[in-house]
Interface confidence: low
């Protein structure tokens, strides 16, 4: 058993039929010695008396809020949550496996630049009685600070018969050094509690590996005289690290016909302009990627040819 | 060429070669993003290669103040990786394919380090740790890890030279 926060405790249980469970001793937080009784949740049934209560925790029915009273007055509470371990593996019932970029990916994180700011998100089908708490650090043996905000519900989607809920959190490294080469990964830890079930999820990454720039901005076409060619120009996204002479991007320009089956023409360039042939009903799209490190491409910015 | 005491390197040449190094490092190990090498244990391997750290003066301001600190750090790293790529980690079994970019990568590391250090001047060079994998699979894993950290190292070096070429060239 360990303390998650004040008056909230997590009991770790090996989860199999007829498992013996864990013996837990609860102590009433009071100077009183006599006349103390114990109850569980809303029930008025007295479970025991005295300053301590010993219970055998085997299943969710044994978890919940234990309260000690004296003469009708509440003295203190202890909330017991369960963390299940099945076949040596901690349960992952609360979050959905996003399966990208690999199986057992419950947390996904992205950064728009090298400032040390990043966003993580996760999915669940659970809509109520759900809380999350997020901690992060750089490195684990001698951790350096990363500050995370509160996790918030950021999207709801319908997937078949189910509703899916996306939660996200923003974190910022306290002493970020954008120009340095990272040697210790960022660690992100999410505590999830659904009703009386506790689970924890972790992710470890370098900022450089989760970089995904915003799409290029101010995408414009300038027709060239007496020609089907156009000059496409764009700018670095506002959110990208500066100076751009140091934090450089490379770009992919694509001409795409109306039909998905039509051949796509692609040009790669380090400049912020390119000359392409604009076909009727086609569109021109541009996306960006770090010039020197192959992290994710941005989403496309697009304009129609006409 | 970077000479302690002050003269500038050939920023544009360094920029071109460092960008080529980035391309080669990724073509030598392109699928690296799909393999989380930190799960493979012994993560300290990548802590025992030279990292360009916060105090090394490789940020835009540090380069403006005195690029020598940073250039020395980059030179040290290039020599380190050049020696690793020439060691039995890469020359031993399993053999690299004849058209593997590792040979080119090795030569380019040497080329860039020579651009930074003229004949007759010696910055302090680094002792290479004895990384001695006994099994071919361990050697393969070590190659991946070294290439992975090399990708990060040359990315920072390429940013330095790009910025230098744009803002510090005479």
């Amino acid at each position: 058993i360990w303390e998650l926060k004040k008056d909230v405790y997590v009991v770790e249980l090996d989860w199999y039929p007829d498992a013996p469970g864990e013996m837990v001793v609860l102590t009433c937080d009071t100077p009183e010695e006599d006349g103390i009784t114990w109850t569980l949740d809303q029930s008025s049934e007295v479970l025991g008396s005295g300053k301590t209560l010993t219970i055998q925790v085997k299943e969710f029915g044994d978890a919940g809020q234990y309260t000690c009273h004296k003469g009708g007055e509440v003295l203190s509470h202890s909330l017991l949550l369960l963390h299940k371990k099945e076949d040596g593996i901690w349960s992952t019932d609360i979050l959905k496996d996003q399966k990208e970029p690999k199986n057992k990916t419950f947390l996904r994180c992205e950064a728009k630049n090298y400032s040390g700011r990043f966003t993580c998100w996760w999915l669940t089908t659970i809509s109520t009685d759900l809380t999350f708490s997020v901690k992060s650090s750089r490195g684990s043996s001698d951790p350096q600070g990363v500050t995370c905000g509160a996790a918030t519900l950021s999207a709801e989607r319908v997937r078949g018969d189910n509703k899916e809920y996306e939660y996200s959190v923003e974190c910022q490294e306290d002493s970020a050094c954008p120009a340095a080469e990272e040697s210790l990964p960022i660690e992100v830890m999410v505590d999830a509690v659904h009703k009386l079930k506790y689970e924890n999820y972790t992710s470890s990454f370098f900022i450089r590996d989760i970089i995904k720039p915003d799409p290029p901005k101010n995408l414009q076409l300038k027709p060239l005289k007496n020609s089907r060619q156009v000059e496409v120009s764009w700018e670095y996204p506002d959110t990208w690290s500066t100076p751009h002479s140091y934090f450089s991007l490379t770009f992919c320009v694509q001409v795409q016909g109306k039909s998905k089956r039509e051949k796509k023409d692609r040009v790669f360039t380090d400049k912020t302009s390119a000359t392409v042939i604009c076909r009727k009903n086609a569109s021109i799209s541009v996306r960006a990627q770090d010039r020197y490190y192959s992290s994710s491409w941005s989403e496309w910015a697009s304009v129609p040819c006409s | 060429r970077a000479v302690p005491g002050g003269s500038s390197p050939a920023w544009t040449q360094c920029q071109q070669l460092s960008q080529k190094l980035c391309t080669l490092a990724w073509s030598a190990h392109p699928l690296v993003g799909h393999m989380d090498l930190r799960e493979e244990g012994d993560e300290e391997t990548t802590n025992d290669v030279p990292h360009i750290q916060c105090g090394d003066g490789c940020d835009p301001q540090g380069l403006r103040d005195n690029s020598q600190f940073c250039l020395q750090r980059i030179h040290q790293g290039l020599i380190f990786y050049e020696k690793l790529l020439g060691s039995d980690i890469f020359t031993g079994e399993p053999s690299l394919l004849p058209d593997s970019p590792v040979g080119q990568l090795h030569a380019s590391l040497l080329g860039l380090s020579q651009l930074l250090q003229p004949e007759g001047h010696h910055w302090e060079t680094q002792q290479i740790p004895s990384l001695s994998p006994s099994q071919p699979w361990q050697r393969l894993l070590l190659r991946f890890k070294i290439l992975r950290s090399l990708q990060a190292f040359v990315a920072v070096a390429a940013r330095v030279f790009a910025h230098g070429a744009a803002t510090l060239s005479p």
Epitope: L184 | D42, E44, T45, N47, D48, E124, Q126, P129
Partner: nanobody, 128 residues
Framework: EVQLVESGGGLVQAGGSLRLSCAAS????????MGWFRQAPGKEREFVAR????????YYADSVKGRFTISRDNAKNTVYLQMNSLKPEDTAVYYC?????????????????????WGQGTQVTVSS
């Protein structure tokens, strides 16, 4: 704070062997690189060997290469220095030390000032 205790020193004839141990208490060593140094009477403390956290990367002073082997057992929280073909010039007090930084820091591993925790030392005397 980590406490380091060296053992295994003693008097040995030239050509002989000794195995030094460095046991840690107070904190696990598995997150840290560890080094051995030695100090002969009237001389500066000098670098002998260093081993990285998981034992993959190892450095030796030129004077001991091929004769000394550094190793570690993280489960036992212990670092070892196997010393073979000992010479009279290996006579010194041998110290083990913890490197606080997980970063590679150039030649800093050679400098005693780079290490933040030290043992009391164990005397090794090699007679001719």
């Amino acid at each position: 704070e980590v406490q380091l205790v060296e053992s295994g020193g003693g008097l040995v004839q030239a050509g002989g062997s000794l195995r030094l141990s460095c046991a840690a208490s107070g904190r696990t060593l598995s997150s840290y690189a560890m080094g051995w140094f030695r100090q002969a009477p009237g001389k500066e403390r000098e670098f002998v060997a260093r081993i990285s956290q998981g034992g993959t990367a190892i450095y030796y002073a030129d004077s001991v290469k091929g004769r000394f082997t550094i190793s570690r057992d993280n489960a036992k929280n212990t670092v070892y220095l196997q010393m073979n073909s000992l010479k009279p010039e290996d006579t010194a007090v041998y110290y083990c030390a913890k490197d606080p930084s997980p970063y590679y820091r150039g030649s800093a591993y050679l400098l005693s000032g780079s290490y933040d925790s030290w043992g009391q030392g164990t005397q090794v005397t090699v007679s001719s």
